[in-house]
């Protein structure tokens, strides 16, 4: 169901429009539901989900993570470079969004949607932003060789590597949830 | 089985510092989503949300107690520890650690401590 | 700081009846707001989370509902187990706050 249908928007009918902060939240929650039934399916085909061999992949994965300096964090929060930040973080999580497009096989639909939803995201937090001259779009040259590194890899590194970006963009999401909260 | 149990001094006397211990088993505290909070209870009134740790390190007090509290975490030891500074009668309450755990952040405490009463 | 206030704050009612509590907030916390049940002597549990959603082995009679500012707690067909104060509880941003407490005497 898309954010801003449910069935709890149905019951409501004297509820007001949904304003910019909520429709971030739904947003990211909706990704959110997205990446735990893909995060299934992957759990389901493979033992990635409880393998101590991580390390191994993330290396050569340059995945988006919060840092404090990032002004995230409740210790040195900044509304605005963190919003930089999260666009930011987002933008650079596009191509490994890419990459996931055909690394499922039943849920194809799913992997397609939370992909379309990120890029609607990022649309509604760039209106929320300030500075957009701060934010720096990842090069698309570069993005276009990560992509055929990343599917050149055997097939054990390409389930570890769908594996890392769900997590990751998971907790990039879940961090950014809190944040956003914050503002 | 997620379980968590508080230890530290039933005692402590007035300007000394409380250091709580929190003991968890059952879940990572270095898992996306999950969050353990410090909650206390005077005798007879309600409850009153202290301090939060989360997986990443991010943590949150509460303003008006915020420069006495410290929260730390020791993911291998499956630990959390608060300590507050200076503490006073008024400080009296049952101290209760609690573990959130959820994809969407709802902060709810969905496992509590038994509590452990500091006079 | 988001206010969290209950109402009433204590009420008393008999097995089999059905009772309702609100909880308002004092800005939007969306559907953020979790409920507690503590008996005396005892650690709280969580009752309902996201405003509407039953905790695991949380029986069907309690049922929370609202959003944005305005929560309630309803609980049918009352059993002696329910007896207690609950709490509800801010889980939108931090500070995290708890309202005062609505007692139910059974």
């Known amino acids: 169901v898309p954010p801003g249908e449910d069935s709890k928007d149905v019951a409501a009918p004297h509820r007001q429009p949904l304003t910019s902060s909520e429709r971030i939240d739904k947003q990211i929650r909706y990704i959110l539901d997205g990446i735990s039934a893909l995060r299934k399916e992957t759990c389901n085909k493979s033992n990635m989900c409880e393998s101590s061999k991580e390390a191994l992949a993330e290396n050569n994965l340059n995945l988006p993570k919060m840092a404090e300096k990032d002004g995230c964090f409740q210790s040195g929060f900044n509304e605005e470079t963190c919003l930089v930040k999260i666009i930011t973080g987002l933008l650079e999580f596009e191509v490994y969004l890419e990459y996931l497009q055909n690394r499922f096989e039943s849920s194809e639909e799913q992997a397609r949607a939370v992909q379309m939803s990120t890029k609607v995201l990022i649309q509604f937090l760039q209106k929320k932003a300030k500075n957009l001259d701060a934010i720096t779009t990842p090069d698309p040259t570069t993005n276009a060789s990560l992509l055929t590194k990343l599917q050149a890899q055997n097939q054990w590194l390409q389930d570890m590597t769908t594996h890392l970006i769900l997590r990751s963009f998971k907790e990039f999401l879940q961090s950014s949830l809190r944040a956003l909260r914050q503002m | 089985q997620v379980t968590l149990k508080e230890s530290g001094p039933t005692l402590v006397k007035p300007t000394q510092t409380l250091t709580l211990t929190c003991s968890f088993s059952?879940?990572?505290?270095?898992?996306?989503?999950?969050?353990v909070g410090w909650v206390r209870q005077p005798p007879g009134k309600a409850l009153e949300w202290l301090a939060f740790i989360f997986w990443d390190d991010d943590k949150y007090y509460s303003p008006s107690l915020e420069s006495r509290l410290t929260i730390t975490k020791d993911t291998s030891k499956n630990q959390v520890v608060l300590t507050m500074t200076n503490m006073d009668p008024v400080d009296t309450a049952t101290y209760y650690c609690?573990?959130?755990?959820?994809?969407?952040?709802?902060?709810?405490?969905?496992?509590w401590g038994q509590g452990t009463l500091v006079t | 700081d988001i206010q969290m206030t209950q109402s009433p704050s204590s009420l008393s009612a008999f097995v089999g009846d059905g009772v309702t509590m609100t909880c308002w907030a004092s800005q939007s916390i969306n559907d953020y707001l979790n409920w507690y049940h503590q008996r005396p002597g005892e650690a709280p549990e969580l009752l309902v989370f996201a405003a509407s959603n039953l905790q695991i082995g949380v029986p069907s009679r309690f049922r929370g509902s609202g959003s944005e500012t305005y929560f309630t707690l309803t609980i049918n067909s009352l059993q002696p187990e329910d007896s207690g104060t609950y709490f509800c509880?801010?889980?939108?941003?931090?500070?995290?706050?708890f309202g005062g407490g609505t007692k139910l005497e059974i």
């Open positions: 509880q801010n889980g939108h941003s931090f500070p995290l706050t």
């Open positions: 609690a573990r959130s755990a959820d994809d969407y952040l709802y902060y709810s405490f969905d496992t």
């Open positions: 059952g879940f990572s505290l270095s898992t996306s989503g999950v969050g």
